[in-house]
């Protein structure tokens, strides 16, 4: 699929930082989402997981950005092998984990 360019990845990282910085209150009322396999297809996987969270304005921009990175249409309730469907975590932790991974990709130059 399409690989997000440098600037798009930076914008996504910045948005994830914005919604988590110094944040201890649960994001999205403590909603839980499926963990994802960070090794491949991370953008689609993240979208597949987060798209199941509705009515949470804090992550709407993130959802839109991820949909721009994913080559196929993702709908709520859709599952692929990219989701680790035996583990659910809070949205806040999911976003922090995703952020850490994207920062690694950025440092490695794998945009």
């Amino acid at each position: 699929g399409p690989v997000p360019p440098y600037t798009a990845l930076k914008e996504l990282i910045e948005e994830l930082v914005n919604i988590t910085q110094n944040q201890k209150a649960p994001l999205c009322n403590g909603s839980m989402v499926w963990s994802i396999n960070m090794t491949a297809g991370v953008y689609c996987a993240a979208l597949e997981s987060l798209i199941n969270v509705s009515g949470c304005s804090a992550i709407e921009k993130t959802q839109r950005m991820l949909s721009g990175f994913c080559p196929h249409k993702v709908s709520a309730g859709q599952f692929s092998s990219l989701l680790v469907r035996d583990t659910k975590i809070e949205v806040a932790q999911f976003v922090k984990d995703l952020l850490r991974h994207l920062r690694k990709l950025f440092h490695q130059g794998t945009f």
């Epitope: 930082v17 110094n22 201890k24």
Partner: antibody, heavy 126, light 109 residues
Framework: EVQLVESGGGLVKPGGSLRLSCAAS????????MSWVRQAPGKGLEWVGR??????????NYAAPVKGRFTISRDDSKNTLYLQMNSLKTEDTAVYYC?????????????????WGQGTTVTVSS | SYELTQPPSVSVSPGQTARITCSGD??????AYWYQQKSGQAPVLVIY???KRPSGIPERFSGSSSGTMATLTISGAQVEDEADYYC???????????FGGGTKLTVLG
């Protein structure tokens, strides 16, 4: 050794300018969010502003009393943080510290890492 | 502008428990950080993210938070703990830092 060393303080007249520098060593400076904090004589700590790491947008934020007069920048190739102070006022007289920003510690992978410089004194007086 | 409120001073005898409070409207959703500053020295972080202790900080230092109040507790205060203590956090946006006015801890020798 992990350390921060400030320089550039001194005596300046009201309305004047000064640029402070903060040289970092012993850690990956480019990953760190950095802050400037000041302390007027006999007073408490006052947050001046912060700059995020470049990867996190390089965004700057400032406290209301200095916004529009002070500018924070960084040069990751030199491991150096700067504070450009313009239109200085007598109330800007203080010891200025540079420090790693704890709010950004998670993103820099420096969870709980705390580094402060020894401070540099700025005196604004006619 | 956003403010954090601390008591100006707290006094305890050696071995007693010292509690220093910090109140702010955004503290239910934003973490608090605590710094110790001894005379003529740079501040030192003693608690981050409400209750986590950096390596090298003695176990007698602990932190907690409930609602709009964060608390630094020093269990069995020692004479060397005498210092100014500052709470630090951010406004609700997370973008702007703020320090409390500071609390002078006196450990009566």
């Amino acid at each position: 050794e992990v350390q921060l060393v400030e320089s550039g303080g001194g005596l300046v007249k009201p309305g004047g300018s000064l640029r402070l520098s903060c040289a970092a060593s012993g850690f990956t400076f480019s990953n760190a969010w950095m802050s400037w904090v000041r302390q007027a004589p006999g007073k408490g700590l006052e947050w001046v502003g912060r700059i995020r790491s470049e990867i996190d947008g390089g965004t700057t934020n400032y406290a209301a009393p200095v916004k529009g007069r002070f500018t924070i920048s960084r040069d990751d190739s030199k491991n150096t943080l700067y504070l450009q102070m313009n239109s200085l006022k007598t109330e800007d007289t203080a010891v200025y510290y540079c420090a790693t920003d704890q709010v950004g510690a998670y993103y820099g992978d420096y969870y709980g890492m705390d580094v402060w410089g020894q401070g540099t004194t700025v005196t604004v007086s006619s | 502008s956003y403010e954090l409120t601390q008591p100006p001073s707290v006094s305890v005898s050696p071995g007693q428990t010292a509690r220093i409070t910090c109140s702010g409207d955004a503290l239910p959703e934003k973490y608090a950080y605590w710094y110790q500053q001894k005379s003529g020295q740079a501040p030192v972080l003693v608690i981050y993210e409400d209750s986590k202790r950096p390596s090298g900080i003695p176990e007698r230092f602990s932190g907690s938070s409930s609602g709009t109040m964060a608390t630094l507790t020093i269990s069995g205060a020692q004479v060397e703990d005498e210092a100014d203590y500052y709470c630090h956090s951010t406004d609700s946006s997370g973008n702007h830092g703020v320090f409390g006015g500071g609390t002078k801890l006196t450990v009566l020798g």
